[in-house]
């Protein structure tokens, strides 16, 4: 499919001008190659009319130009003094006319309307309001006022001052007679339809002395704004319909076959399943304007979108609308990244988030998509050191691996973590990606004890058991804080006995805290990585307490550690042996910190998008 994009149809009137914008992927080659505008012949050729290399056909001499905007990836063809002879099929393209790097454009130039003398022309957008002003003389001040529409050869009454309203205009038309001082009546028609276009006649009086005024009403279907975005990127539709519809329900719909327009999202809470997790409706301003952001763009998202206002929250005749034609460029600069990441309860996920590598200094964000109100993605963590309180100790954003990718690690997973998350930066707004976390059946791969209590001044050893599947991975311990996870020295204690059917390649790696101080209290993670790519992690909370009196020491230690096989050594060296690996009490499946999460978050269920781009918690 050609990555060149432009307007499918351009309509104008004789004598007028048109400006046609064509989009191309702004690669170095494309920016500098020849741009052209050619007319398609009956036998399939395409005759160049103008090109970026200076050629201008004699038919266009003095009335056309072609301007390239390489920084935007667009070029613009302006054609003036249009005639009906200019109607036809054209191509805008790059390179050689026959190469296929082009887009088909249909240009239709119509004859200007043959208007009667003294005709006032009203040009109004579809769905809007028109006020037709009708002057009259004093002698007709008390006489009947009326508005007719010319249908074929006959005028048909639309409204009059005796209270008649044509059924086609019911509920959306009124006739106002100005105060006595002004010799003027006006007809206001709301929610204009395409069928309202035509010639009107307003009249005051019914005899030969009546005052008449001709009006030509042109109802314009909005020209779609062309939007060119990359596959996997995002698009923002800014919809400004005016303050008169500020309090009316808003919608964004996508035109399917014919006149159907399927609601994508609306302010009444409707959302199309295909956009679950990747659409946000920004709440409207006081003037009624709003915006819709769609991320993770797919090929099938291309098409015509309309935004509008109607109490039903969907397109109806007479809805004021704005239109866009979205083209999704498959020659995308945005790298593929998994759209689904799977983890198990008690386990972890490591999510890779792409960003524009030119913006390495931008702030990186990770937020939780909330479908309920269509418009929220509350921040969970950023690259500046902020972590939402309920996620302390189990969430970290790392700038690694860098060069266009950052990593988010979330551990101590529970079913409530299932849902959609967005990766954002405060730089290029087109780089927003969505990932769905799914919680699947299974056991965490890394085995650590439950929460641990250390004693001031003593030495603490905490084990982490790695199965053989991680034999080739680097194993580490680190101390979590809100800016990341600071690496700590650890000891490889040899093969682990924690895994059935696992050979000598399994490993027990211990963290040792010597001469424990109050500052050692906090969350510790053990994990695996390959270079700058992170895999699974497991978290342990280490509490620090004063040494107890000798008589009560053993009991309280066993309780505090929730580790029944812990040995307390006379030397003041405490080792958590953790032999009873199958004992569920040893593992932080759902720690207290997970239970304290904001109840307002509610329960989030995952929606399977059926994506083929899935990754497990430990793969990359």
């Amino acid at each position: 499919k050609s990555p060149i994009f432009g307007p499918e149809e351009v309509n104008s009137v004789e004598g007028n001008s048109v400006s046609i914008t064509c989009y191309y992927p702004p690669t170095s080659v494309n920016r500098h190659t020849r741009k052209y505008w050619c007319r398609q012949g009956a036998r399939g050729g395409c005759i160049t009319l103008i090109s970026s290399e200076g050629y201008v056909s004699s038919k266009y001499a003095g009335r056309a130009n072609l301007t390239n905007f390489p920084e935007n990836g667009t070029f613009v063809v302006n054609i003036a003094q249009l005639s009906q002879d200019d109607s036809g099929r054209y191509k805008c393209g790059l390179g050689i006319n026959s190469r296929g790097l082009s887009f088909d454009v249909s240009l239709e130039v119509s004859q200007g309307p043959g208007l009667l003398n003294d005709t006032k022309v009203y040009t109004v957008d579809l769905g809007r309001t028109v006020t037709i002003n009708c002057p009259f003389k004093t002698e007709n001040a008390q006489k009947r006022k009326s508005l007719y529409k010319q249908i074929g050869l006959y005028p048909v009454l639309v409204i009059d001052s005796s209270g008649y309203v044509n059924p086609n205009y019911t509920g959306r038309i009124r006739l106002d007679i100005q105060g006595t001082g002004q010799l003027l009546f006006s007809v206001v028609i709301n929610q204009l339809r395409l069928s309202d276009a035509g010639q009107y006649l307003c009249q005051a009086g019914d005899d030969s002395n009546s005052n008449k005024k001709n009006a030509d009403l042109q109802v314009l279907k909005p020209e779609p704004e062309l939007v060119y975005e990359d596959l996997r990127g995002s698009v923002t539709f800014h919809c400004a319909l005016g303050p008169e519809v500020a309090n009316v329900a808003k919608f964004l719909c996508r035109q399917s076959s014919g006149e159907n327009c399927d609601v994508v999202v609306n302010t009444l809470g409707k959302r199309a399943p295909a956009f679950e997790g990747r659409i946000l409706l920004n709440p409207q301003d006081k003037d009624g304007s709003f915006s819709v952001v769609i991320t993770g763009l797919r090929k099938e998202d291309a098409g015509r979108y309309l935004c509008g206002a109607h109490s039903d929250g969907q397109l109806q005749e007479g809805s004021p609308i704005q239109a866009w034609q979205l083209f999704v460029n498959e020659e995308s600069t945005i790298p593929r990244s998994p759209t689904v990441v799977k983890g198990v309860a008690g386990g972890s996920v490591a999510v890779l988030c792409p960003y524009n590598r030119k913006e390495s200094k931008s702030i990186k964000y990770w937020c939780l998509w909330e479908g309920a109100q269509n418009g929220r993605c509350p921040l969970l963590v950023d690259s500046e050191g902020w972590v939402k309180a309920q996620y302390e100790g189990r969430l970290s954003l790392l700038e690694e691996p860098g060069n266009g990718t950052f990593t988010v690690i979330l551990n101590q997973l529970t079913s409530r973590d299932a849902g959609f998350y967005w990766c954002l930066t405060n730089g290029d707004t087109l780089w927003r990606t969505t990932v769905e976390i799914k919680i699947i059946e299974g056991e965490p791969n890394l085995k650590v004890p439950g929460n641990v209590t250390a004693v001031l001044g003593e030495t603490l050893k905490v084990p982490c058991h790695f199965p053989c599947k991680f034999s080739s991975y680097e194993k580490y311990w680190c101390k979590w804080n809100n800016t990341g996870c600071q690496a700590l020295p650890s000891q490889d204690e040899g093969p682990s006995k924690a895994f059935v059917n696992c050979d000598e390649n399994s490993r027990l790696v211990s963290l040792t805290l010597n001469l424990v101080t109050r500052a050692d209290e906090g969350w510790y993670w053990c994990g695996v990585k390959q270079g700058h790519f992170y895999g699974e992690t497991a978290a342990v909370y280490v509490a620090v307490e004063e040494r107890k009196a000798a008589g009560s020491r053993d009991v309280s230690l066993a309780k505090a550690d929730a580790a029944p096989d812990e040995k307390v050594l006379d030397s003041g060296f405490r080792e958590i042996e953790n032999k009873a690996i199958q004992d569920p009490r040893l593992f932080a499946e759902e720690k207290a910190v997970a239970d304290t999460r904001d109840q307002a978050d509610g329960s989030r269920a995952s929606v399977d998008s059926g994506s083929s781009e899935e990754q497990g918690g430990s793969s990359r």
């Epitope: 946000l280 920004n282 709440p283 952001v293 964000y365 937020c367 418009g375 929220r376 993605c377 509350p378 921040l379 950023d382 500046e384 050191g385 902020w386 972590v387 939402k388 309180a389 954002l424 405060n426 707004t429 809100n482 800016t483």
Partner: nanobody, 131 residues
Framework: QVQLVESGGGLVQAGDSLRLSCAAS????????MGWFRQAPGQEREFVAA????????YYADSVKGRFTISRDNAKNTVYLQMNSLEPGDTANYYC????????????????????????WGQGTQVTVSS
């Protein structure tokens, strides 16, 4: 909701120092940025300094760079503005402001220097610098 109470304002000579404090209470777990703004009589409210509540990154208006220092004490939910080498042009009412963590996509675009980014405001404390 978050409540903010400023203190430390007063009347000083040009060249002197002053330290303003702003204590936050309420739902402080949602704090994202804390900032100081000032407003002189008949003037618009203007940005002075801001601090990121998580990592502590600081932002300053050009007019106060090198003279004013913003800092925070997360444990006390308090932000400070240390003002050195004060000038008569620093005379104004100083307001403490707090910003919630972003929730809407537009929030992510807002900068700590923007007055519209902040959700909560204190009553202000007067600083007068005489020459």
């Amino acid at each position: 909701q978050v409540q903010l109470v400023e203190s430390g304002g007063g009347l000083v000579q040009a060249g002197d120092s002053l330290r303003l404090s702003c204590a936050a209470s309420g739902r402080t777990s949602s704090l994202y940025n804390m900032g100081w703004f000032r407003q002189a009589p008949g003037q618009e409210r203007e940005f002075v300094a801001a601090i990121h509540w998580g990592g502590g990154r600081t932002y300053y208006a050009d007019s106060v760079k090198g003279r004013f220092t913003i800092s925070r004490d997360n444990a006390k939910n308090t932000v400070y503005l240390q003002m050195n080498s004060l000038e008569p042009g620093d005379t104004a009412n100083y307001y403490c402001a707090a910003r919630r963590a972003p929730e809407l996509l537009d929030d992510y675009k807002q900068k700590p220097e923007e007055i519209g980014a902040y959700h909560y405001w204190g009553q202000g404390t007067q600083v007068t610098v005489s020459s």
